[in-house]
């Protein structure tokens, strides 16, 4: 069964078959005997019963309103209502492009990665039985596909098959014909992937520093969406509160990954921060990658070759 | 912007009364249904009364009788006339607004206001 029309805002295009179905459709079939009324209002029109006899376009049944087809005067509030349910639509009929195929404000956007699975269907359950031919467009040029019921591609992606797709389906009612159409809008995107996440620079980096000043041990990595990036140093975490793990900055790159940094703040330098480890670690499902800093007097600076420093 | 603001709550004796009001954007006004809800201390929140489309209105059995439901289109505000207040009527007292209402539940895209405190003491 089609199921029932519960966003509050519907946006459609003029010209095309339309419908609205409340959402206590199962419990109107039980209560047959029930009344059932449906009301539009829109700006100094408050609230008219709609019926047969409104408009030779509105066809109501117990679930369903429908506009064969709907027009951009149809704009307005809609409302069902039976014993103690009620249910408001607001619908907004824009005009169609008359020099496309498709309204571009009616368009459903799509990415897919190539080389991966990418699929399009021409379906349209709730008018199914009186469907009498569809087809699909690509950039508005008829794709001529085997099946003219319900064409479908099927294939990996290639950056050639980016475009816009159309499906339209032209069917009959009380002897007019009519067409809906459904458009995507494809995006084919490099290969998203993930990485193995690298922490930039050496491994080890000897940080020259002054007693009583501070220092800001940057660390950089670039890793996937979901991969984390942390500070490890002493015995016990937080227990200097001289140190301080700053918010962690994130850019995404070109190719979809995400350059990450995160500094470690050491205040007021003392002794007991010189000559120990604090490591920098990038996690992943696949596994880690750790740097270490090490702070060293200015003073002892001679005793280690200068290409292992950082500034 | 959709937005419900009550006011009206505050501390009562009980069989006092008490007249909550709730304003809204023409948005939340316009919508399927408004009503009041309350919760009070450690419990879930409970339907107190709604006006549906075309004034129909539903109330919770504890405040039949003695609760009046009542709304004024030119000013967007919805109103709850409590009378005969009861001890178990304490709580916070929300406005709330719906596009799918079913009597007193709210099933579909729902706005809330912040609420309003009432205080009823024997």
């Known amino acids: 069964a089609e199921s029932c029309t519960s966003r509050p805002h519907i946006t459609v295009v003029e010209g095309e078959p339309f419908y609205l179905k409340h959402c206590s459709c199962s419990l109107a079939h039980e209560i047959e005997t029930t009344t059932k009324s449906w009301y539009k209002s829109s700006g100094s029109q408050e609230h008219v019963e709609l019926n047969p006899r409104s408009s030779s376009r509105i066809a109501l049944h117990d679930c369903v309103l429908e506009f064969w087809p709907v027009e951009l005067n149809d704009t307005g509030s809609y409302f069902f209502q039976m014993k103690n349910y009620t249910q408001k639509w607001k619908l907004n009929v824009i005009r169609r492009n008359k020099h496309s195929c498709f309204t571009e404000r009616q368009v459903t956007s799509k990415i897919v990665e190539v080389k991966k699975f990418f699929q399009i269907t021409c379906e349209n359950s709730y008018y199914q039985t009186l469907v009498n031919s569809t087809s699909l467009y690509k950039n508005c040029k008829k794709l001529l596909l085997e099946n003219n019921k319900n064409p479908t591609i099927k294939k990996n992606a290639e950056f050639e098959d980016q475009g816009y797709y159309s499906c339209v389906h032209f069917l009959h009612h009380n002897g007019k014909l009519f067409n809906i159409t459904k458009t995507f809008n494809i995006t084919i995107v490099e290969d998203r992937s993930n990485i193995v996440p690298v922490l930039l620079g050496p491994k080890l980096n000897h940080v020259a520093v002054e007693l009583g000043k501070n220092v800001r041990l940057n660390c950089s990595a670039l890793l996937n969406e979901e991969d984390v990036i942390y500070w490890m140093f002493g015995e016990e975490n937080g227990s200097d509160p001289n140190i301080h793990e700053e918010k962690e900055m994130r850019i995404m790159t070109p190719e979809g990954k995400w350059h990450a940094s995160k500094v470690l703040r050491i205040e007021n330098i003392g002794e007991s921060n010189l000559n120990v480890l604090y490591n920098c670690t990038v996690a992943s499902t696949g596994g880690t990658d750790t740097k270490s800093f090490i702070l060293v007097r200015k003073a002892d600076m001679a005793d280690i070759p200068g290409h292992v420093f950082t500034r | 912007q959709v937005q419900l603001q009550e006011s009206g709550g505050g501390p009562v004796q009980a069989g006092g009364s008490l007249r909550l009001s709730c304003s809204a954007s023409t948005t939340a006004y316009d919508n399927a249904c408004m009503g009041w809800f309350r919760q009070a201390p450690g419990k879930e929140r409970e339907g107190v009364a709604s006006?549906?489309?075309?004034?129909?209105?539903y109330y919770a059995d504890s405040v039949k009788g003695r609760f009046t439901l009542s709304r004024d289109g030119a000013s967007k505000t919805l109103y709850l006339q409590m009378n005969s207040l009861k001890p178990e009527d304490s709580g916070t007292y929300y406005c709330?607004?719906?596009?799918?209402?079913?009597?007193?539940?709210?099933?579909?895209?729902?706005?809330w206001g912040q609420g309003t405190q009432v205080t009823v003491s024997s």
């Open positions: 006006i549906h489309l075309r004034d129909r209105t």
């Open positions: 709330a607004s719906s596009n799918i209402c079913n009597g007193l539940n709210l099933q579909g895209n729902t706005y």
